[in-house]
Interface confidence: medium
Amino acid sequence: TALSPTPTTMTFTPAPLEETTTRPEFCKWPCECPQSPPRCPLGVSLITDGCECCKICAQQLGDNCTEAAICDPHRGLYCDYSGDRPRYAIGVCAQVVGVGCVLDGVRYTNGESFQPNCRYNCTCIDGTVGCTPLCLSPRPPRLWCRQPRHVRVPGQCCEQWVCDDDARRPRQTALLDTRAFAASGAVEQRYENCIAYTSPWSPCSTTCGLGISTRISNVNARCWPEQESRLCNLRPCDVDIQLHIKAGKKCLAVYQPEEATNFTLAGCVSTRTYRPKYCGVCTDNRCCIPYKSKTISVDFQCPEGPGFSRQVLWINACFCNLSCRNPNDIFADLESYPDFEEIAN
């Protein structure tokens, strides 16, 4: 996966099906599916197969793929059949460098920022879409309000909070409200004629491999809300972390590779080596997420052309105490966002 320690180059030769050039049929109609869908490893998407019949665990980078067993679309993988000439029956899942994204049937180029509607700003990086809400009213504006309502205002994109229980209440709780908002993890500072606001980082868009985390900040010269993004990699997809769990234990909070290596991103290599910590896994229904982390800047050098730098989530420590809602849905964490359906639908 991108932004993971540089992988060793592997060549793959598909096993011969039979000594013939006839193309095997991988799809059967009518569909024959197991009664219950499979349980996929953490970070592997549960998708409909290429026959549009059954739920399957998507094939990952380097896995065999066929017209039925398709590659993970969330990872920007495609089935490379070039090693199976002339039948083109079994391929290998490969990464498209700088792959674009598709959201609601619209294709976006790698690195493109876009607004699917007026309430969200999204960014496409290597096949992954990360979105951040632009309407920054996550809670009622008055602490004393017992019956708040979220209403649409004609001519305005974002809904506003209305308090029905006491319209005569004096408006003297604004400072308290600001403090309550700051306590939620948002960074607040007062500038002249501007309350600077930085939202918390959104959850990483993938449970393993390269993802995006975004936030909104108006800490700039214009005091204008702008989206910031950082790359995140909670855990590698190509390592079975469960194998590292000690005997008698149910979780491994942190997984750390033995050796420091370079990060790679779209064919470019970090200018220095890193030995990152990754969040581990549990054998029960708990999830491991970052507990102590920060954002670092990683410089990349490209074989041809100029280098660049990217903001990257750096994990210091993780904890394993949350229930996993759906470990195969890489956008599961977005469900806690207001108006999530507006992104998903």
Epitope: G185, V187, P200, A253, V254, K292, K294, N316
Partner: antibody
Framework: QMQLVQSGAEVKRPGASVKVSCKAS????????INWVRQATGQGLEWMGW????????GSAPAFQGRVTMTRDTSIGTAYMELSGLTSEDTAVYYC?????????????WGQGTLVTVSS | QSVLTQPPSASGTPGQTVTVSCSGR????????VDWYQHLPGTAPKLLIY???RRPSGVPDRFSGSKSGTSASLAISGLQSEDEADYYC???????????FGTGTKLTVL
């Protein structure tokens, strides 16, 4: 020159709260985590928790969870540690210390310490 | 209750080399780097070694650190009278999510 300067000694009654401040200077306050460590008389060093001044995120050792609150004011480069429900066992010298956890560089700068005495 | 164990005391004569040990477990010393601190009475602790074997600028090269498995050690060569202090090892613990200090070793220069 990089330094951390803490508030003065405090005497508190059991059950009360104490708030210790730690003012940073000589470096970018939001680039380094602030940790709190205490040492009771005749005892070893005990880590209480950490705070990221940039995000305001913090975490504390299980022994202090529910009793310790770590906050900051980035405009004046100051971190605060408030400990509530004080007992005589909380009598100790409290230190703030900075660390760059990304570089695993240890606690490379410490405050001078604040003596908190809990007595009835 | 500290999870890093150090000998309570150590001693040596000027010029000698003294080693202080620190024993932990796989979740702290075994999987993270170790820091060493010198603590003189009435002063703030001072970082001596970080990342198991690296010295901050200003720390004499008489101080060196090493780590193997779940144990770490601090060596002080050419012992001097001003080295008389308490020494603590410390490491992050991935299971407890705490930065754990060792029990401390009181070094006496005879």
């Amino acid at each position: 020159q990089m330094q951390l300067v803490q508030s003065g000694a405090e005497v508190k009654r059991p059950g009360a709260s104490v708030k210790v401040s730690c003012k940073a200077s000589g470096y970018s306050f939001t680039n380094f985590d602030i940790n709190w460590v205490r040492q009771a008389t005749g005892q070893g060093l005990e880590w209480m928790g950490w705070m990221d001044p940039n995000s305001g995120n913090s975490g504390s050792a299980p022994a202090f969870q529910g009793r310790v609150t770590m906050t900051r004011d980035t405009s004046i480069g100051t971190a605060y540690m408030e400990l509530s429900g004080l007992t005589s066992e909380d009598t100790a010298v409290y230190y703030c210390a900075r660390d760059d956890f990304y570089d695993s560089s240890g606690f490379d700068a410490w405050g001078q310490g604040t003596l908190v005495t809990v007595s009835s | 209750q500290s999870v890093l164990t150090q000998p309570p005391s150590a001693s040596g004569t000027p010029g000698q080399t003294v080693t202080v040990s620190c024993s932990g477990r796989s979740s702290n010393v075994g999987s993270n780097t170790v820091d060493w601190y010198q603590h003189l009475p009435g002063t703030a602790p001072k970082l001596l070694i970080y990342s198991s074997n690296r010295r901050p600028s200003g720390v004499p090269d008489r101080f060196s650190g090493s780590k193997s498995g779940t144990s770490a050690s601090l060596a002080i060569s050419g012992l001097q009278s001003e080295d008389e202090a308490d020494y603590y090892c410390a490491a992050w613990d991935d299971s407890l999510n705490v930065y754990v200090f060792g029990t401390g070793t009181k070094l006496t220069v005879l």
